[in-house]
């Protein structure tokens, strides 16, 4: 349904508060270096303009597309060329090329200072002094650091952020109340950002079909009682929502997400029995709740898949007449029967089935050709099962920190060209799969672990894409979305790598390490470990363990010393010499 004024339409649908918040997020995700005040000014100008369009949809410029209006506004920023360099060239383009240009310049790793959390009293004062500015600043800081953050979900995070301050700034022990809540929001926010980044990568790098396949599998697991037609409708709508958000169309995305939540709640009976509680919540909570809702129970007595997908004489006819519909039905039927499989595994099975039909439905004896297709699934299912079993055993044996270290060594040997900060970040996140998933029973381990690993490996892929240094990473990242994890798992030590020159500075530590949090101290040690492997890629586990144990003892000793700095300087030299000898550097 066409509206005379798109901006008026969205303003009315979303309301002023959400409209302003979403425009701020959009602008901060595009111009990640701009100061907060500049963005607020731009948002206010857009909001005032939108109000004039609400009053009179025929007013001047009200008929322009949102991309045109927002792009024109962004291109008024005076320091565009100085701050963003070639991104300023986007402003010479016409829509839709201009918006595509802005999207291409989104930076997954912007050069921004780390967010330092002020004292609780300082935060509470700022919150009370100007609640609106305080919350806008939260949206701005998260959006500019996470340019693909799912905008309607960020509104939900902001609502929880506000609730935390409202409650805790009145509490007797403000810090005890607030800090755990902020930690939780931070961790959930990082996870949410990474999950959404995978969705956008899926759409942008592999296309709508890949995203729809993912959505069919996931929604079929979640809503196994829903009919295929219902799942297909949800997939179409969900694809539209995520295409819009990933494309910077945040107002449309938030509006359509609200419509989808409304539809789901109005049709709960034909979707899932688990939606009742979600659907009683207000909009933002409702949408979040639906997105996280547990899988419904599988219908009883589902027939064997073989009847329709192997034994039927119409397999090739059905496939040829509507390939994607037939494959979609296969994926739906398989996924609703297998909540115990990861989505990526289900997609691998569907790809295998598709490849088999492409081959066999052109063969002289199609039925004989595809009769054993389900046998081909067995090794595909066993591979992640075995990998998860082995790694959970290793995790239980080592604990999270040492398990992360094992992965750091493993991945540094596979792709030593990748920057040390990226290897540390990615390996630490890979290592978190242990505490996140290994506690689950067998039936929940694979969907937890492998789908989480897909999210983490996508972080590696997007960071590597910005500055490509390894052909092996590029290959694993670009060849197949669903085979990224098996591709990385299959990589052996890179024999072509020329070890890094030894630099004593890399292994020089100072007393400041003693005042760091446990997490920051771990990162320092893990950074050293990566550098060690880059210098000596053929070092054995035992050699590396010995050096790292010595290093831990050295830090502990010097942090207890009276003259810490002297200890670090003198003992550090000895440690470097001993390590060089131990590793034969």
């Amino acid at each position: 349904d066409a509206h005379k004024s798109e901006v008026a339409h969205r303003f009315k649908d979303l309301g002023e508060e959400n409209f302003k918040a979403l425009v701020l997020i959009a602008f901060a995700q595009y111009l990640q270096q701009c100061p907060f005040e500049d963005h607020v000014k731009l948002v206010n100008e857009v909001t005032e303009f939108a109000k004039t369009c609400v009053a009179d949809e025929s007013a001047e410029n009200c008929d322009k597309s949102l991309h045109t209006l927002f792009g024109d506004k962004l291109c008024t920023v005076a320091t565009l060329r100085e701050t963003y360099g070639e991104m300023a060239d986007c402003c010479a383009k016409q829509e839709p090329e201009r918006n595509e240009c802005f999207l291409q310049h989104k930076d997954d790793n912007p050069n921004l200072p780390r967010l330092v959390r002020p004292e609780v009293d300082v935060m509470c004062t700022a919150f009370h002094d100007n609640e609106e500015t305080f919350l806008k600043k939260y949206l701005y800081e998260i959006a500019r650091r996470h340019p693909y953050f799912y905008a309607p979900e960020l509104l939900f995070f902001a609502k929880r952020y506000k609730a935390a301050f409202t409650e805790c700034c009145q509490a007797a022990d403000k810090a005890a109340c607030l800090l755990p809540k902020l930690d939780e929001l931070r961790d959930e926010g990082k996870a949410s950002s990474a999950k959404q980044r995978l969705k956008c990568a899926s759409l942008q790098k592999f296309g709508e079909r890949a995203f729809k396949a993912w959505a069919v599998a996931r929604l079929s697991q979640r809503f196994p009682k829903a009919e295929f037609a219902e799942v297909s409708k949800l997939v179409t709508d969900l694809t539209k929502v995520h295409t819009e958000c990933c494309h910077g169309d945040l107002l449309e995305c938030a509006d359509d997400r609200a419509d989808l939540a409304k539809y789901i709640c109005e049709n709960q009976d034909s979707i899932s029995s688990k939606l009742k509680e979600c659907c009683e919540k207000p909009l933002l909570e409702k949408s979040h709740c639906i997105a996280e809702v547990e899988n419904d129970e599988m219908p009883a007595d589902l027939p064997s898949l073989a009847a329709d997908f192997v034994e039927s004489k119409d397999v090739c006819k059905n496939y040829a007449e509507a390939k994607d519909v037939f494959l979609g039905m296969f994926l739906y039927e398989y996924a609703r029967r297998h909540p115990d499989y990861s989505v990526v595994l289900l997609l691998r099975l569907a790809k295998t089935y598709e490849t088999t039909l492409e081959k066999c439905c052109a063969a002289a004896d199609p039925h004989e050709c595809y009769a054993k297709v389900f046998d081909e699934f067995k090794p595909l299912v066993e591979e992640p099962q075995n990998l998860i079993k082995q790694n959970c055993e290793l995790f239980e044996q080592l604990g999270e920190y040492k398990f992360q270290n094992a992965l750091l060594v493993r991945y540094t040997k596979k792709v030593p060209q990748v920057s040390t900060p990226t290897l540390v970040e990615v390996s630490r996140n890979l290592g978190k799969v242990g505490s996140k998933c290994c506690k689950h029973p067998e039936a929940k381990r694979m969907p937890c672990a492998e789908d989480y690993l897909s999210v983490v490996l996508n972080q590696l892929c997007v960071l590597h894409e910005k500055t490509p240094v390894s052909d092996r990473v590029t290959k694993c990242c670009t060849e197949s979305l669903v085979n990224r994890r098996p591709c990385f798992s299959a990589l052996e030590v890179d024999e072509t790598y020329v070890p890094k020159e030894f630099n004593a500075e890399t292994f020089t530590f100072h007393a400041d390490i003693c005042t760091l949090s446990e997490k920051e101290r771990q990162i320092k040690k893990q950074t050293a470990l990566v550098e060690l492997v880059k210098h000596k890629p053929k070092a054995t586990k035992e050699q590396l363990k010995a050096v790292m144990d010595d290093f831990a003892a050295f830090v502990e000793k010097c942090c207890k010393a009276d003259d810490k700095e002297t200890c670090f300087a003198e003992e550090g030299k000895k440690l470097v010499a001993a390590s060089q000898a131990a590793l034969g550097l």
Epitope: K313, C316, K317, A320, E358, K359, C361, A362, A363, A364, D365, P366, E368, C369
Partner: antibody, heavy 118, light 106 residues
Framework: QVQLQQSGAELVRPGSSVKISCKAS????????MNWVKQRPGQGLEWIGQ????????YYNGRFKGKATITADKSPTTAYMQLSSLTSEDSAVYVC???????????WGQGTTLTVSS | QIVLTQSPAIMSASPGEKVTMTCSAS?????MHWYQQKSGTSPKRWIY???KLASGVPVRFSGSGSGTSYSLTIRSMEAEDAATYYC?????????FGAGTKLELK
Amino acid sequence: QVQLQQSGAELVRPGSSVKISCKASGYAFSNYWMNWVKQRPGQGLEWIGQIYPGDGDTYYNGRFKGKATITADKSPTTAYMQLSSLTSEDSAVYVCARGVLLGSFDYWGQGTTLTVSS
Amino acid sequence: QIVLTQSPAIMSASPGEKVTMTCSASSSVSYMHWYQQKSGTSPKRWIYDTSKLASGVPVRFSGSGSGTSYSLTIRSMEAEDAATYYCQQWGSNPLTFGAGTKLELK
């Protein structure tokens, strides 16, 4: 564009063997069946067999089992058919053809004429 | 194996005339394909999956049928249509061709 280029005409003695080739270009050779068809002068078409170069799977017309052996090589994207124990009955034009979904042959080679004569 | 019987074996038609040739299978087949062959050349795919026209085939051609009975029709004969037409079944191993219908220009 898709092309199937066959080897040249062959004149061979009865009892001997011959191997004719079909060089494919312009498509993903591994992902399509390559079929071989026999046509005797003034007569109809007879399907001999097919190979899937991706994994080497083959199907034969029972009438040609033991007579024809179909192989494929992925690196020069070429399919081959060896005919053994040749007799005058094997004199014919042999054509390779790419098979697609639901079993039709969308591209054909130009044909290789085999003459078996003493 | 499935035997395909094409009829007539030979036929002639004047320009503008409607032409129908048939292909009868000894038992039910899934799909029928038709090829056109002119002397000295390899066959060309003409109609596939029973009723779809191959690229470049004039719209005056059509195909239809199911089970054991299939046909190829030319709405209005033209000189360039003179050729031999072969049917081929898919769905039963081995793949088989009919003996052909030779269409001549009257």
